[in-house]
């Protein structure tokens, strides 16, 4: 074989270069034919009525032609012919890659509730070959299920992702990313999750600052409730008892002036929204007034589990006997 060609892969709309090379030339006519076996070039002359073909180089050892604005219909075998005895022929295959026309992401619900499973679909239309779709929630890759539909040598890929949402997912992007040989860099589309969740309630002691409650002192507790939608109702109650008469309620704040031992007990902040309700408890223990001048040594330890936060305050030498759990979130 005296005639050589190389296969060509080109992205739709770009330029393909076809080269016919002759090892030992005897000045025979070299001709390039299209997949319909019509002559594109006869040596350096183009008889074919398609001006997208242009001569790059012609010599006795090479015919090199460019094809601009390549379309899917240009795909196929191109033949180099050498008018020798016997005539020689070699073919090159042009493969046309088509990037996905459109990338669409569709979420089953605009707003989901924590714990709910939602369906997210991503469609990459009319590519060749078929597109690979990858899913990410933030930076975490997830596994979807893809279906491929073929029509006229083009592929439409739809990938389905079933996603159980959590409150932490609120505002996190769900990313549909395509991988395709005709696409350089990242081609992706994303939608931000909107997740509604029941309130998370935290009680913060804003006074006294050192955290030790003694007779005669004041106590101020602030209830922080975060949820989506933002909780409409934040209420304070005293568990198993009436609220002290000298307690003042002001929105999320509970203020008890002139503490005494009868105020001991559990104070609960309750918050609710359309998703549900939650509460956090504060256990008040009122200590005797101080008998010594030096300030007490205070150690604060916070222990967190997935469902409950326990705040333990060890206040002085008696705390070994009287140490109490002060705040519990539910």
């Amino acid at each position: 074989q005296n005639l050589f060609t190389k296969d060509v892969t080109v992205i739709e709309g770009e330029v393909a270069t076809i080269s016919c090379q002759v090892n030992k030339s005897d000045d025979s006519v070299i001709q390039l034919l299209n997949p319909n076996r019509q002559t594109i070039y006869f040596r350096d002359f183009r008889p074919l009525k398609d001006s997208r073909f242009q001569l790059l180089n012609f010599s006795s050892s090479e015919l090199k032609v460019s094809l601009t604005n390549v379309s899917i219909s240009d795909e196929g075998r191109y033949f180099c012919q050498l008018y020798t005895d016997p005539p020689q022929e070699s073919y090159t295959t042009i493969t046309v890659l088509v990037p996905p026309r459109n990338l669409m992401i569709d979420i089953q619900k605009d707003t989901a509730v924590e714990g709910e499973e939602i369906e997210v679909n991503c469609t990459a239309m009319a590519s060749k070959p078929a597109t690979t779709i990858r899913w990410f929630k933030g930076n975490t890759e997830l596994k979807g299920k893809s279906e491929v539909e073929e029509w006229s040598d083009m592929y439409t890929v739809t990938s389905q992702l079933m996603l159980k949402v959590h409150k932490e997912d609120d505002g996190v992007p769900v990313i549909c990313q395509v991988e395709h040989p005709a696409v350089t860099g990242n081609l992706q589309t994303q939608r931000y999750l909107e997740v509604q969740y029941k309130p998370q309630v935290h009680i913060q002691m804003t006074y006294p600052l050192q955290g030790l409650t003694r007779e005669g002192d004041a106590l101020e507790l602030t209830c922080e409730a975060i949820g989506k939608p933002q909780p409409v109702m934040v209420t304070w109650v005293r568990v198993d008892d009436e609220m002290p008469q000298h307690a003042v309620l002001s929105g999320p704040n509970l203020f008890i002036n002139n503490l005494n031992k009868t105020d001991n007990g559990t104070y609960r902040c309750e918050a609710s929204n359309i998703v549900g309700k939650a509460h956090s408890d504060y256990m008040l223990y009122v200590y005797d007034p101080p008998t010594t001048i030096p300030p007490p040594t205070t150690t604060t330890t916070t222990t967190t589990t997935t469902t409950t936060t326990i705040l333990t305050i060890i206040t002085d030498s008696r705390a070994g006997e009287e140490g109490s759990i002060r705040a519990v979130d539910h």
Epitope: V29, Q38, F42, L48
Partner: antibody, heavy 111, light 108 residues
Framework: EVQLLESGGGLVQPGGSLRLSCAAS????????MQWVRQAPGKGLEWVSS????????KYADSVKGRFTISRDNSKNTLYLQMNSLRAEDTAVYYC?????????WGRGTL | QSELTQDPAVSVALGHTVKITCQGD??????ASWYQQKPGQAPLLVVY???KRPSGIPDRFSGSTSGNTASLTITGAQAEDEADYYC???????????FGGGTKVTVL
């Protein structure tokens, strides 16, 4: 001067033979495919035969296939047409022409 | 074998424009070439490819193709343009040649 000059035409009986020659000058003969085209008296042009630049490739019109043979001698810059089993309808002026897909150079013809 | 069809004769007033047409399926694929032949002379290439002219051919000669019809236009015909004009192409395989029957152009 770039030119083609045909010779070898003449009167021959039906069934007879004739060999036409075409001498090329002024260009690299071995580089070009060549053709024979004929024109019967008062008629249009009719393509007869083609040959590749090295001589290995040949094609014929259906009307002459099996009776005519095209050949070339690149060392002599000459194109030939061997015509056998001649018929009255082969009467024509025979032109040799240079092939670049189109025919850009013609001889004056031989009858 | 393909066939190319030409009108047998057309006439044109001196200095006017004449269009000679040639019909054939091959022109859907390939460009035509056109040859001028005066009495007693060999044919002469006047137009080829995508409206190209060999050197020495006046620019009043131009070629075009549309669908299966190739055309040769002489814009501002001169007395010396009176001749027979032949269209030529190859069949779709590119191996066999075919000529039109010729059009006799008379300049009045």
């Amino acid at each position: 001067e770039v030119q083609l000059l045909e010779s070898g035409g003449g009167l021959v009986q039906p069934g007879g033979s004739l060999r036409l020659s075409c001498a090329a000058s002024g260009f690299t003969f071995s580089f070009y495919p060549m053709q024979w085209v004929r024109q019967a008296p008062g008629k249009g042009l009719e393509w007869v035969s083609s040959i590749g630049s090295s001589g290995g490739y040949t094609k014929y019109a259906d009307s002459v296939k099996g009776r005519f043979t095209i050949s070339r001698d690149n060392s002599k810059n000459t194109l030939y047409l061997q015509m056998n089993s001649l018929r009255a309808e082969d009467t024509a002026v025979y032109y040799c022409t240079r092939d670049r897909w189109y025919f850009d150079l013609w001889g004056r013809g031989t009858l | 074998q393909s066939e190319l069809t030409q009108d047998p004769a057309v006439s044109v007033a001196l200095g006017h424009t004449v269009k000679i047409t040639c019909q054939g399926d091959t022109f859907r694929t390939y460009y035509a070439s056109w040859y001028q032949q005066k009495p007693g002379q060999a044919p002469l290439l006047v137009v080829y490819g995508e409206n190209k002219r060999p050197s020495g051919i006046p620019d009043r000669f131009s070629g075009s193709t549309s669908g299966n019809t190739a055309s040769l236009t002489i814009t501002g015909a001169q007395a010396e343009d009176e001749a027979d004009y032949y269209c030529h192409s190859r069949d779709n395989s590119g191996h066999l040649h075919v000529f039109g029957g010729g059009t006799k152009v008379t300049v009045l």
